[in-house]
């Protein structure tokens, strides 16, 4: 289904406007901000979600060491330009003609420049490391149980194929989820790891993007898993290009 037919809503994206104006009176949903039609049977792209968010009213040891090329989204929110497929355009600019290049998850990967800045291609983020710290519990979670439940979560809630969940590491209280998806691995219809990570990030923050579903309630053998902080690192297929000035700052 493209949307819930009964009341014409989008189960996977509450930041939409839906109406029965599709072919044969079918429910069709469009993302806020961009007005682009979205497929409500899967996750909406991060670019369209960010655009919708910006248009909405403002009140509404076994652990992996991130590589030196890992990016963290320090720039926060911006109103992105999305291509006709809903992906980030390689070059993003703000209203004051400051431009920069982004990767496939919309995170800046170059220094900021002016309108003459060129971004030849959209560089794919092929490895995402989600670093979580859980609240204290009576004892540590069983690593195997934790792996099983986090895989189930990504599979069931975000429809991410298990082969893209490369690993779940655990050293109490730190959990690391590694998502990997090369361009060659991603088939038509596969959820993008960047979109899954964004939905997960919003769920963890208590800002679920799903329509009408309760927030994320994750339990491992009945024990609630409550996250108190999240850090997400992004690794691109081509390392980012920042000046030494930024790296030493």
């Amino acid at each position: 289904h493209t949307a819930a037919q009964d009341n014409c809503t989008c189960p996977t994206n509450k930041m939409t406007v839906c109406s029965p104006d599709g072919p044969g009176g079918r429910c069709q949903c469009r993302a806020l901000g961009s007005g682009m039609a979205v497929d409500c049977s899967t996750l909406t792209s991060k670019c369209l979600l960010l655009k919708a968010r910006m248009s909405a009213p403002k009140n509404a040891r076994t652990l992996v060491r991130p590589s030196e090329h890992a990016l963290v989204d320090n720039d926060g929110l911006y109103d992105p330009d999305c291509d006709p497929e809903g992906r980030f355009k390689a070059r993003q600019c703000n209203q004051t003609s400051v431009c920069w290049c982004v990767n496939s998850v919309g995170v800046r990967r170059t220094d900021k420049g002016d309108l003459s800045l060129r971004c030849d291609e959209l560089v794919r983020t092929h490895h995402i490391l989600i670093d979580l710290r859980h609240r204290p519990t009576a004892g540590a979670f069983n690593h195997s149980d934790l792996d099983a439940e986090l895989r189930r979560l990504f599979r069931e809630r975000y429809r991410l194929h298990p082969k893209f969940v490369a690993a779940v590491h655990y050293e109490q209280p730190t959990i690391q989820i590694e998502l990997r998806q090369n361009t060659s691995q991603k088939a038509a219809g596969d959820v993008d790891i960047g979109d899954a990570a964004y939905y997960f990030e919003r769920d963890i923050k208590g800002e679920s993007l799903f329509q009408g579903r309760g927030g994320l309630d994750l339990r491992v053998r009945g024990e609630p898993l409550q996250v108190e902080r999240t850090l997400i690192y992004y690794l691109d297929e081509i390392p980012p290009k920042f000046s030494m000035k930024r790296l030493t700052a």
């Epitope: 195997s144 069931e156 194929h161």
Partner: antibody, heavy 117, light 111 residues
Amino acid sequence: QVQLQESGPGLVKPSQTLSLTCTVSGYSISSGYYWNWIRQPPGKGLEWIGYISYSGRNLYNPSLKSRVTISRDTSKNQFSLKLSRVTAADTAVYYCARDTTAYFDYWGQGTLVTVSS
Amino acid sequence: DIQMTQSPSSLSASVGDRVTITCRASESVSSSVNRFLHWYQQKPGKAPKLLIYRASNLESGVPSRFSGKGSGTDFTLTISSLQPEDFATYYCQQSNEDPYTFGQGTKLEIK
């Protein structure tokens, strides 16, 4: 000790809706785990139908998704299966089972449902 | 869907024999930490009973003559010394991907 018990009519007419209930004792279905329905046609293997989670989320087998609804009544500690538009191919022993971390550790004893006019 | 293929489909053996049943998945059912492959025993007119979870973990109360091993796509269930109560049908099940799927079963009969 966790126990599961299926109940419901043993005979359903073709094109009607099969309705079964699983009553759980010894554990609250809203406290954790995943509560499943599995079926087994006479003399055949096992087929997973779907589950409802501790938080009320559903996951169904795509081969049955258009006909299946699994719901729950936490006040009675029960979860239910509805399978619409049944045919003779839906004749089976229906089991409810608890999924711990993706395996089934507790099962009901099963109930045979025959689809026949 | 992941297809689970068990071999043999049926097997005749005697009390005291060592028996091995194989289960092959059409794609890997392992993660870096887990092997999402489980074994059940079913006797006529009864519900299946969990024997082994995650490929090699013995469920509480299951005799130690049962053991499991394997990873990726190939798994085995071994009964080291058959007892009269072991004659039953055995099923493997994967839970790496939904829908969860079972093998077609291996019927273990008395020779």
